[in-house]
């Protein structure tokens, strides 16, 4: 199939960093500068992304595939191939319309993205607060209250060492 | 043709002032948040600061906040940023922004300024 297919489209024989010019006999010539294309049997090259502005350039482009932006420090990418950045915040912070807010009490955000979450609540796994929330921190939950009632040890002290073949004396 | 014109840069000793202006031709900034960039030699571009498009509200780097000023005169169709306090850290290419959805986010078809040099001597 493929032998009869290069035969009627001679176009499918040029590889991916060419272009199939019908202004030159369809033949297979290079992507001109700034272009590319990633596959075999283009008619055209695509023009290479630019990285402006607040975009910054990830991975060069080349002649069979295109340029990968990032964004510029304090901001983030968003969308499918970082299409738009956003702002950054500090951890204990969530973007808002109003700019970067600092987290509602009992929640937080450990991020410089995101939206502030609540803290865990330890009592639904029957778990004591171990150490409190912050803006920037999760609780940390520890054992259960009733693990830490007067008297009882959270930690099981280890067995006495036997030798073997011994009785404890 | 749509453009963004930065205006106002120059020479400053540290701590003097200087105003940018930043004048819109082709479209009307009334409708977009105007945001200022300033890249230094070597650096990457940093955000300066931002005004919105709806109730001029303003926003500001750490670096800059209590020193510069974004202010805007839609009848004018100019965004300004009045820097005073210079130091020679504040030494870049300024450039003006106007993003399409707002001051926090930046998009690859917004328009930007060919930026205006701002050099602070000690």
């Known amino acids: 199939f493929e032998r009869t297919r290069s035969l009627q489209d001679p176009c499918s024989n040029c590889p991916a960093g060419t272009f199939c010019d019908n202004n030159r006999n369809q033949i297979c010539s290079p992507c001109p500068p700034n272009s590319f294309s990633s596959a075999g049997g283009q008619r055209t090259c695509d023009i290479c992304r630019q990285c402006k502005g607040v975009f910054r350039t990830r991975k060069e482009c080349s002649s069979t595939s295109n340029a990968e932006c990032d964004c510029t420090p304090g901001f983030h990418c968003l969308g499918a191939g970082c299409s738009m950045c956003e702002q950054d915040c500090k951890q204990g912070q969530e973007l808002t319309k109003k700019g970067c807010k600092d987290c509602c009490f009992g929640t937080f955000n450990d991020q410089k993205r995101g939206i502030c979450r609540p803290w865990t609540n330890c009592s639904l796994d029957g778990k004591s607060v171990l150490v409190n929330g912050t803006k920037e921190r999760d609780v940390v939950c520890g054992p259960s209250p009733a693990d830490l009632s007067p008297g009882a040890s959270s930690v099981t002290p280890p067995a006495p060492a036997r030798e073997p073949g011994h009785s404890p004396q | 043709q749509v453009q963004l014109q930065e205006s106002g840069g120059g020479l400053v000793q540290a701590g003097g002032s200087l105003r940018l202006s930043c004048a819109a031709s082709g479209f009307s900034l009334d409708y977009y948040a105007i945001g200022w960039f300033r890249q230094a030699p070597g650096k990457e571009r940093e955000w300066v600061s931002c005004?919105?498009?709806?109730?001029?509200?303003?926003y500001y780097a750490d670096s800059v906040k209590g020193r510069f000023t974004i202010s805007r005169d839609n009848a004018k169709n100019t965004v300004y940023l009045r820097m005073n306090s210079l130091k020679p850290e504040d030494t870049a290419v300024y450039y003006c922004?106007?993003?399409?959805?707002?001051?926090?986010?930046?998009?690859?078809?917004?328009?930007w300024g060919q930026g205006t040099q701002v050099t602070v001597s000690s």
């Open positions: 005004i919105t498009a709806s109730d001029s509200s303003a």
């Open positions: 922004a106007a993003p399409r959805s707002d001051c926090f986010h930046y998009g690859e078809n917004d328009y």
